[in-house]
Amino acid sequence: LQDPCSNCPAGTFCDNNRNQICSPCPPNSFSSAGGQRTCDICRQCKGVFRTRKECSSTSNAECDCTPGFHCLGAGCSMCEQDCKQGQELTKKGCKDCCFGTFNDQKRGICRPWTNCSLDGKSVLVNGTKERDVVCGPSPADLSPGASSVTPPAPAREPGHSPQ
């Protein structure tokens, strides 16, 4: 014997109180598959959550976060606060990046500035809390006479100007 409820399509439920007739889901509820004996309550996007997709009789509402927050967790179950560039979100809120670190995003953690000298390069632009350092060319990459590395000062005789 086939279960009469299996004929009930998505958007309906098999109503035991009415001889297993397929009844439409009540307002603010949905069933995303056929053969359901109940409809699920629609998710409500309130507070810091805002509605990205309205609930229908066959699919749940989808939420995202209001400006200043971003989604976390499956199906945007949480809204985490954005920080400013130059900050990171800690367990106790947004904190400025420590000296020597930067964050150019509104989320994520502060990362250390690039160490130019590890690649044999010089610092062309200093780092800030919001931006990484910019490494300049290595001395070997420079044409003669264009070195950014200051040569040692020549020995000076008294009364002479430096060369």
Epitope: L89, K91, K92, I109
Partner: nanobody
Framework: EVQLVESGGGVVQPGGSLRLSCAAS????????MTWVRQAPEKGLEWVSS????????YYADSVKGRFTISRDNSKNTLYLQMTRLTAEDTAVYFC?????????????????WGQGTTVTVSS
């Protein structure tokens, strides 16, 4: 599959108590620090408390210190949050979360898995 399932939420009067549980599966529970966070209706995510894998080190947000106690039973793969002297400001969805290592602190989020949450409503 790594899973975290919270339970124990409900409606409680101001001044009352609740104990939340978080059942973990799919990973070696004792090897990882665990964290509770909460999402109040009009606010962003708020860190509540963290505990190291061994259970020796615990950390609390200032807003819950002295009222909430985090604990874990590694033999049962379960995390707990005992909440006392509850106020309306504690109304939120509470999520448990797995951190990425055995140690934790009150600074860095190092969360890689979240539960689905359990709702706590404090109302008279």
């Amino acid at each position: 599959e790594v899973q975290l399932v919270e339970s124990g939420g409900g409606v409680v009067q101001p001044g009352g108590s609740l104990r939340l549980s978080c059942a973990a599966s799919g990973f070696t529970f004792s090897n990882y620090a665990m964290t509770w966070v909460r999402q109040a209706p009009e606010k962003g995510l708020e860190w509540v408390s963290s505990i190291s894998g061994s259970g020796v080190s615990t950390y609390y947000a200032d807003s819950v210190k002295g009222r909430f106690t985090i604990s874990r039973d590694n033999s049962k793969n379960t995390l707990y949050l005992q909440m006392t002297r509850l106020t309306a400001e504690d109304t939120a969805v509470y999520f448990c979360a797995k951190e990425g290592s055995s140690e934790t602190d009150d600074h860095y989020y190092n969360v890689d898995v979240w539960g689905q949450g359990t709702t706590v409503t404090v109302s008279s």
